[in-house]
């Protein structure tokens, strides 16, 4: 079974986020993929992709790029020059419309705290490097502890479809996920 | 500790099928990619792909596409690579990886290695 | 596809020696760059992460530098069990490829 979790990813102001979010190519190669941060109850969506062409371009809006990689099932996400409000629950998801999106796992809880240094995002550290185990004292690019029950609000009268390997999953009316925390 | 076994040597002629396996323990399976990369005795290091033990998607390059499959088993903590059309080019030492960041991070260092599965095609 | 050349793709040096090892990408791959040392008949070790970060346990006289597409490789003070075929490899994007590797003898 697929594991829903929540993954923690922790930066100072003026770092650059860097993720990757995998799809299943025989389903959605030629789909759109969107960039969303859930605001409420709603989603709200970021930057969206074109409809794959055979070379994939990279769209960049604002402070975000997404490079589509249609024949590897994977869409990268840049979030540059990171800032405290970016601080939420961000998701990939296949666009549709809004009211239906695929959404693709893990959704990312992003935390971003002021820069201890006088110039954040300075060449040398402008992303975060430590991306070691939970059982290390660095913060972990990765599921780590968060609460067992996380809620999360889904649109009202919104159908949200969990792509999982050879099934998928309608939560309909979704009000809350339980998400389960990963220890190494 | 972080360990990745793989299944022993394969001997296989031109036009079989060979499958892989790399036993991971140490670790959450789930959490983390594994990629497969290949070495053709004397050559270089060559990646092939990626696949995420927790959704089950996989991907690999063009060269591979339509002669690869990588698949998982959750329960074993197993992951597979499935070569078919087997050619005398394919004889290589194939390492299964672990990827330094988890599954959700754009960090492709490749952090574990299995010991690596020699594969001999000859007829 | 990005390609990776490393320079030399072979060299000898002395035990002490301070040893050079380049690597150009075909276009900027940022800080998008890995180091492996491979000895004969084992797997790969990463050595350096992101260009130049040294992975947990690799002797403090190995480092890396370099953004963009140019690359550098140290070894500050030869041993030798340093020894090997080391190889660059790049992530900025996708397909992941490697530099043709460089191997090192001890003169």
């Known amino acids: 079974t697929t594991e829903l979790t929540e993954e923690k990813y922790e930066y100072k102001e003026g770092q650059t986020l860097e993720v990757k979010c995998d799809y299943a190519l025989e389903k959605y190669a030629n789909s759109r993929k969107a960039w969303q941060k859930m605001e409420g109850k709603m989603p709200k969506i970021l930057a969206k992709t074109e409809r794959p062409s055979e070379n994939s371009h990279p769209v960049q809006v604002g402070r975000i790029t997404l490079e589509d990689y249609p024949d590897h099932g994977l869409l990268q996400v840049r979030m540059t020059n990171l800032q405290v409000e970016d601080s939420g629950l961000y998701q990939c998801v296949i666009y549709q419309h809004p009211k239906e999106s695929h959404v693709l796992f893990n959704p990312i809880c992003l935390v971003v705290t002021k820069g201890s240094s006088g110039t954040p995002g300075s060449s040398e550290n402008s992303t975060q490097n430590v991306y070691r185990t939970p059982s290390t004292t660095a913060k972990a690019l990765g599921p780590r502890y968060t609460s067992p029950r996380t809620v999360t609000q889904a649109p009202p009268e919104s159908t949200v479809v969990v792509s999982t390997p050879g099934s998928e999953i309608n939560l309909t009316n979704v009000t809350d996920i339980i998400r389960v925390p990963v220890f190494n | 500790q972080v360990q990745l076994v793989q299944s022993g040597a394969e001997v296989k002629k031109p036009g079989a099928s060979v499958k892989v396996s790399c036993k991971a323990s140490?670790?959450?399976?789930?959490?983390?990619?594994i990629n497969w990369v290949r070495q053709a005795t004397g050559q270089g290091l060559e990646w092939m792909g990626w696949?995420?033990?927790?959704?089950?998607?996989?991907g690999s390059v063009k060269k591979f596409r339509d002669r690869v499959t990588m698949t998982r088993n959750t329960s074993i903590s197993t992951a597979y690579m499935e070569l078919s059309s087997l050619r005398s080019e394919d004889t290589a030492v194939y390492y299964c990886?672990?990827?330094?960041?988890?599954?959700?991070?754009?960090?492709?260092?490749?952090?574990?290695w299995g010991q690596g599965t020699l594969v001999t095609v000859s007829s | 596809d990005i390609q990776m050349t490393q320079s030399p793709s072979s060299l000898s040096a002395s035990v002490g020696d301070r040893v050079t090892i380049t690597c150009q990408a075909s276009?900027?791959?940022?800080?998008?760059l890995n180091w492996y040392q491979q000895k004969p008949g084992k797997a790969p070790k990463l050595q350096i992460y992101?260009?130049?970060n040294l992975e947990t346990g690799v002797p403090s006289r190995f480092s890396g530098s370099g953004s963009g597409t140019d690359f550098t490789f140290t070894i500050s003070s030869l041993q030798p069990e340093d020894i090997a075929t080391y190889y660059c490899?790049?992530?900025?994007?996708?397909?992941?490829?490697f530099g043709q590797g460089t191997r090192l003898e001890i003169k």
């Open positions: 490899q790049h992530y900025d994007n996708i397909p992941i490829t």
């Open positions: 696949m995420n033990p927790n959704s089950g998607n996989s």
């Open positions: 276009r900027d791959i940022s800080k998008y």
């Open positions: 992101d260009a130049s």
């Open positions: 990886v672990r990827l330094i960041g988890y599954s959700s991070a754009w960090k492709w260092s490749f952090q574990h």
């Open positions: 140490g670790y959450t399976f789930t959490s983390y990619d």
